[in-house]
Amino acid sequence: MMTGTIETTGNISAEKGGSIILQCHLSSTTAQVTQVNWEQQDQLLAICNADLGWHISPSFKDRVAPGPGLGLTLQSLTVNDTGEYFCIYHTYPDGTYTGRIFLEVLESSVAEHGARFQIP
């Protein structure tokens, strides 16, 4: 029986151009975590295998940094990064647990203000 639960940061927001840490935590189970997959809708961002290390999808390699821990750091955020992110925990013997995080990337008011008064 799967007894575990995934705790996530839930709904989070960050400024355009900034970075954010996506973090999940599996609790209430003694199952061994073999791998964590990070996905955004239908896209694979990264895989962290407990023994084999990290795989970063090439389309994200310049903007994704592994860690901290089993988490994932998204950098140079754009408004297009707004959306659902999933942490998929592969465990033994329980099977798969999935957590959801919703990220909203906001236009930076500072950046907008700076752009409006930029000296040519």
């Epitope: 791998q35 896209q43 694979l44």
Partner: antibody, heavy 119, light 107 residues
Framework: QVQLVQSGAEVKKPGASVKVSCKAS????????MHWVRQAPGQRLEWIGG????????SYSQKFQGRATLTVDTSASTAYMELSSLRSEDTAVYYC????????????WGQGTTVTVSS | DIQMTQSPSSLSASVGDRVTITCKAS??????LAWYQQKPGKAPKLLIY???YRYTGVPSRFSGSGSGTDFTFTISSLQPEDIATYYC?????????FGGGTKLEIK
């Protein structure tokens, strides 16, 4: 340039063990995970497992768990795969292969070691 | 375990032909898929990684596409040196698995 050079062909009796070596050069062995893949005559490639030389973590296919042992001697830049309790179905070419930096595809391969199990 | 089914298992084509090989995964593997070329008596060589990225030094006639469970490998204009067996490989989850291979021959 990156090179993976494997030990020579082996002929073993059923029930025996074999240890295949893989000498890495042209890169730092601790920077890439090393995997072992085998290919029986006329068969598909089969992943045995992988070892992360940086932290010593190993991952095995369930099929080989308990029978295969992957190790790395970082000072000698050499990876090893030992397979015990050999049977005729283990007759195959065994390859060491490394995964790319921060990727899981297998970008460099050894030349292969033929292991024949026969009574 | 994730099963990888390649088709066809063998095919014969002429020099200059467009050749397409498909690989179907038994479950979603996103884009965690690579393609390899293996010539007789030699080790496999990486051609395509992450479903659609051509590996360094691989000629542009080789390409890959797909995501999820269905993947395609294409040689846009077959050359004599392309005679080999081609394998797909999923690394979405362990144990990593390979397709049964497609043996390519020249007509």
């Amino acid at each position: 340039q990156v090179q993976l050079v494997q030990s020579g062909a082996e002929v073993k009796k059923p029930g025996a063990s074999v240890k295949v070596s893989c000498k890495a050069s042209g890169y730092t062995i601790t920077e890439n995970t090393m995997h072992w893949v085998r290919q029986a005559p006329g068969q598909r490639l089969e992943w045995i497992g992988g070892i992360n030389p940086n932290q010593g973590g190993t991952s095995y296919s369930q099929k080989f768990q308990g029978r295969a042992t992957l190790t790395v001697d970082t000072s000698a830049s050499t990876a090893y795969m030992e397979l015990s309790s050999l049977r005729s179905e283990d007759t195959a070419v065994y390859y060491c292969t490394r995964s790319s930096y921060y990727r899981y595809d297998l970008d460099y391969w050894g030349q292969g070691t033929t292991v024949t199990v026969s009574s | 375990d994730i099963q990888m089914t390649q088709s066809p298992s063998s095919l014969s084509a002429s020099v200059g032909d467009r050749v397409t090989i498909t690989c179907k995964a038994s479950q979603d593997v996103k884009t965690a898929l690579a393609w390899y070329q293996q010539k007789p008596g030699k080790a496999p060589k990486l051609l395509i990684y992450s479903a659609s990225y051509r590996y360094t030094g691989v000629p542009s006639r080789f390409s890959g596409s797909g995501s999820g469970t269905d993947f395609t490998f294409t040689i846009s204009s077959l050359q004599p040196e392309d005679i080999a067996t081609y394998y797909c490989h999923q690394h979405y989850t362990t144990p990593w698995t390979f397709g049964g291979g497609t043996k390519l021959e020249i007509k």
